[in-house]
């Protein structure tokens, strides 16, 4: 039975040209995390494998940095970065947990962080 929950940074906004941290946290389970995938719609941003460490997709290597923790830092933001991002936690023995973050990249200098929320 999957008892865990994923807490994410929720709906967030950031300025064009700036940086943002995409962060998820798995709680309420003792399952072992074997891998975390970071995906954006039909693109793979990065994988953090418990054995192998971080793999950043070559198409994002120049503007994605691993961390903090199992999170991901997205740099040099453009309006095209607006959209859904998913953290996919592979765990043993529970299985897979998925968290969703919506990022809006703004042209203006006003960019507020959304509230945190939980996905069961």
């Amino acid at each position: 039975m999957m008892t865990g929950t994923i807490e994410t940074t929720g709906n967030i906004s950031a300025e064009k040209g700036g940086s943002i941290i995409l962060q998820c946290h798995l709680s309420s389970t003792t399952a072992q995390v074997t891998q975390v995938n970071w995906e954006q719609q039909d693109q793979l941003l990065a994988i953090c494998n418990a054995d192998l460490g971080w793999h950043i997709s070559p198409s994002f290597k120049d503007r994605v940095a691993p961390g903090p923790g199992l999170g991901l830092t997205l740099q040099s933001l453009t309006v095209n970065d607006t959209g859904e991002y998913f953290c996919i936690y592979h765990t043993y023995p529970d299985g897979t947990y998925t968290g969703r973050i919506f990022l809006e990249v703004l042209e203006s200098s006003v960019a507020e962080h959304g509230a945190r929320f939980q996905i069961p």
Epitope: T34, Q35, Q43, D51, H55, S57, P58, Y92
Partner: antibody
């Protein structure tokens, strides 16, 4: 020499689940930093990557197939398996298993010979 | 996804001639591009990786070039066994393949 061999039913009915297994010989599935993948090729058409798995059971999938795909691993048998649910005639293809050097940013370097799966009632 | 477009779809040449195959990516894949050869009833065989490096055992008549979005596979002098279908594949993101170029005997 590393060898991969696909096995499974050659005929699957529409709406059912396609199941295939890849047996790896000449090397251990869990002894290196490789993922293990599935690729398919409809008759007379091009190649499509389905997804890949690490020996720990961690996966990454083609987004267009993700909702129907499950890849699993059995390290004791040196095998990994593919399940594709709710199949239609469009899933008729030769299915290949291959070694996936994801962390080397490298292409699929060892392939099985492929097995044809036909979806038909 | 990154779309790879290969041209031409078919190339009709004679043994001894030079073959030039093109692969264009919908966005930059840097040098993370490979080429495969496939003969009827066989699995693809890796020829070139990282755009220009020959895989183990591949003859020197096969060469790859390009970076970013435009890539070329050249077969300097076609041997009878080279008539086959050739596919490009990118590794910059989720793996995708081109639609293939068939090199046939003229």
């Amino acid at each position: 020499q590393l060898q991969l061999q696909e096995s499974g039913p050659g005929l699957v009915k529409p709406s059912e689940t396609l199941s295939l297994t890849c047996t790896v010989s000449g090397g251990s599935i869990s002894s290196s930093s490789y993922y293990w993948g599935w690729i398919r090729q409809p008759p007379g058409k091009g190649l499509e990557w389905i997804g890949s798995i690490y020996y720990s059971g961690s996966t990454y999938y083609n987004p267009s197939l993700k909702s129907r795909v499950t890849i699993s691993v059995d390290t004791s048998k040196n095998q990994f398996s593919l399940k594709l649910s709710s199949v239609t005639a469009a899933d008729t293809a030769v299915y290949y298993c291959a070694r996936d050097p994801l962390y080397q940013d490298a292409p699929f370097d060892y392939w099985g010979q492929g097995t044809l799966v036909t979806v038909s009632s | 996804e990154i779309v790879l477009t290969q041209s031409p779809a078919t190339l009709s040449l004679s043994p001894g001639e030079r073959a030039t195959l093109s692969c264009r990516a919908s966005q930059s894949v840097s040098s993370y591009l490979a080429w495969y050869q496939q003969k009827p009833g066989q699995a693809p065989r890796l020829l070139i990786y990282d755009a220009s490096n020959r895989a183990t055992g591949i003859p020197a008549r096969f060469s790859g070039s390009g970076s970013g979005t435009d890539f070329t596979l050249t077969i300097s002098s076609l041997e009878p066994e080279d008539f086959a279908v050739y596919y490009c594949q990118q590794r910059a993101n989720f793996p995708t393949f081109g639609g293939g170029t068939k090199v046939e005997i003229k």
